[in-house]
């Protein structure tokens, strides 16, 4: 009689996670009588997957009824495949005995499991940064197989090039993870900007997965401060306003000081949003000129998003002469500010770090 051969026709089989895998095996002879066993791997550490003669294997079913007369088809079907099932499976013929004796093995079938990557999760910096600074965003996705994967970064639809990507582990594994870090330069216009991490994989049928992060979580746009003053009113009061412009986020506290003494403190709330996502806020102070003998130094002190305070000072010169109602002469403002205006004196405090 011909010598028994164990034939595993497929060198490899690829299956999507959650599906069933069919591993084919046939013997060329009924002789010798004895069971088939399926193993994953080789050597003493091999894992028994199915034993025709004994044991309980709830996920494994023989393709052909083992009680079928003259059965030489020992193919099996493994249900609900997971990445952990990946490996090389061997169909091994045993000769009946006490115990059964291993006789011949098939060449093996490598089972690879196609597993979808998890939805990419994009995380930004722990602390906010200001415009012109570079911040890092990290994108992570896990559990995919095979290892080949493509990751791209976009900012407002424009592809980024400054990023570094790692796929782990480097060697063979049942599934893999990807981690990519992109460096993004912030601008003052980035409050409404978005970064997108896009992952493409064979399991996704050309429909990549995306993870997003809003730059609004990462950016701080410090305010510009401006003073304006209305003409003296009939009741010897001057209305001075401090305009806090183009800031983000909204968390802001403004304090008025008259000659170094706190006059009023206000918190910004429920402000309308500018088109670019920033906020403006105007605070005013009525200064009673007749109550002062000397010049009045007004300071608008702004504490934005927990940063060191920014001060802007404004000197109101009190005139010794009686004034004509409605004239400009009761409050005389001397000097120039950095913008070259001659309406008032504008002294930038040494703590005022923002640029105009």
């Amino acid at each position: 009689e011909e010598e028994l051969q164990v034939i595993q026709p497929e060198k490899s089989v690829s299956v999507a996670a959650g599906e069933s895998a069919t591993l084919n095996c046939t013997a060329t002879s009924l002789i010798p009588v004895g069971p088939i066993q399926w193993f994953r791997g080789v050597g003493p550490g091999r894992e028994l997957i199915y034993h025709q003669k004994e044991g309980h294997f709830p996920r494994v079913t023989p393709v052909s009824d083992p009680t079928k007369r003259n059965n030489m088809d020992f193919s099996i079907r493994i249900s609900n495949i997971t990445p952990a099932d990946a490996g090389t499976y061997y169909c091994v013929k045993f000769r009946k005995g006490s115990p059964d004796v291993e006789l011949k093995s098939g060449a093996g079938t490598e089972l690879s499991v196609r597993a979808k990557p998890s939805a990419p999760v994009v995380s930004g910096p722990a602390v906010r940064a200001t415009a012109e600074h570079t911040v890092s965003f990290t994108c992570e996705s896990h559990g995919f197989s095979p290892r080949d994967i493509t990751l791209k970064w976009f900012k407002n639809g424009n592809e980024l090039s400054d990023f570094q990507t790692n796929v782990d582990p480097a060697g063979k594994s049942v599934s893999y993870s990807i981690r990519s870090t992109a460096r993004v330069v912030l601008t003052r216009r980035d409050v409404h900007s978005q970064v997108i991490c896009e992952v493409a994989h064979v399991t996704l049928q050309g429909d990549p997965l995306r993870g997003t992060a809003n730059l609004s979580e990462a950016i701080r746009v410090p305010p510009f401060l401006e003073f304006t003053q209305q003409s003296m009113r009939a009741d010897n009061q001057v209305n001075v306003t401090c305009q806090v412009m183009k800031f983000y986020p909204q968390r802001l506290q403004l304090t008025w000081l008259e000659n170094g003494n706190v006059s009023r403190t206000e918190m910004a709330s429920a402000l309308p949003e500018n088109k670019d996502g920033t906020y403006n806020w105007t605070s005013w102070l009525l200064v009673n000129v007749s109550a002062h003998r000397d010049d009045v130094k007004l300071t608008c002190q702004v504490e934005h998003d927990g940063q060191p305070a920014v001060n802007k000072s404004f000197s109101v010169k009190v005139s010794a002469h009686p004034k004509e109602q409605g004239s400009n002469t009761a409050a005389e403002n001397t000097g120039t500010n950095e913008r070259g205006s001659s309406d008032y004196k504008d002294d930038d405090d040494k703590h005022h770090h923002h640029h105009h």
């Epitope: 009924l30 003669k53 004994e54 044991g55 083992p66 009680t67 007369r69 003259n70």
Partner: antibody
Framework: QVQLVQSGAEVKKPGASVKVSCKAS????????INWVRQAPGQGLEWIAM????????HYNQIFKDRATLTTDTSTSTAYMELRSLRSDDTAVYYC????????????WGRGTLVTVSS | DIVLTQSPDSLAVSLGERATINCRAS??????????IFWYQQKPGQPPKLLIY???NLDPGVPDRFSGSGSGTDFTLTISSLQAEDVAVYYC????????FGQGTKLEIK
């Protein structure tokens, strides 16, 4: 290792029925056929029938088709052979045997159950 | 049905001598290159024991003084050198269709 343990001896009157059991161990019960064979005193072997425990498919010797019924209980890995309308010439040792190679052969045998039919 | 006829019905052979038992089928028991004949040994008070399967293949644990041969309708069980423990009744069985047994051959020591 494979073991087939049969129920004890029975004495029955003509016309009665007998049900012999065969409890299997040491292998996956549903993966192999069980055969039933009998042997009258001083006589040869006579094949009665076979059953596939996985789906209860049966094949009977025409001589026994009307009187014998094979069943299995997969929860206890036990096979049963019931013989009805007993006659004195049904007195025999009844064996269960497992077909290990799906060749319709009998690789492993129980020790037998003696059924005596006598008035 | 296929009928199996064994010959002789009984046989006496000296220890160490060759014993030969024949089994003839009423029609061929061959299919797909296999001969569906099996040989059993039954000692007094014991169940039968499988010796040979598919005409010529020794079941594991069976001494190699036993051998089987033949094809189609004519088959032979041979014990090359009879031992005392070989005293038994020997049966052939076919499974080309539903199984049947030969009537048995009683082997004794001369």
């Amino acid at each position: 290792q494979v073991q087939l343990v049969q129920s004890g001896a029975e004495v029955k009157k003509p016309g009665a029925s007998v049900k012999v059991s065969c409890k299997a161990s040491g292998y996956t019960f549903t993966n192999y056929w069980i055969n039933w064979v009998r042997q009258a005193p001083g006589q040869g072997l006579e094949w009665i029938a076979m059953i596939d425990p996985s789906d209860s498919e049966t094949h009977y010797n025409q001589i026994f088709k009307d009187r014998a019924t094979l069943t299995t209980d997969t929860s206890t890995s036990t096979a049963y052979m019931e013989l009805r309308s007993l006659r004195s010439d049904d007195t025999a040792v009844y064996y269960c045997a497992m077909d290990y190679g799906s060749l319709y052969a009998m690789d492993y045998w129980g020790r037998g159950t003696l059924v005596t039919v006598s008035s | 049905d296929i009928v199996l006829t064994q010959s002789p019905d009984s046989l006496a052979v000296s220890l160490g001598e060759r014993a030969t038992i024949n089994c003839r089928a009423s029609k061929s028991v061959s299919s797909s290159g296999y001969n569906y004949i099996f040989w059993y040994q039954q000692k007094p008070g014991q169940p039968p024991k499988l010796l040979i399967y598919l005409a010529s293949n020794l079941d594991p644990g069976v001494p190699d003084r036993f051998s089987g041969s033949g094809s189609g309708t004519d088959f032979t069980l041979t014990i090359s050198s009879l031992q005392a423990e070989d005293v038994a009744v020997y049966y052939c069985q076919h499974s080309r269709e539903l199984p049947t047994f030969g009537q048995g051959t009683k082997l004794e020591i001369k």
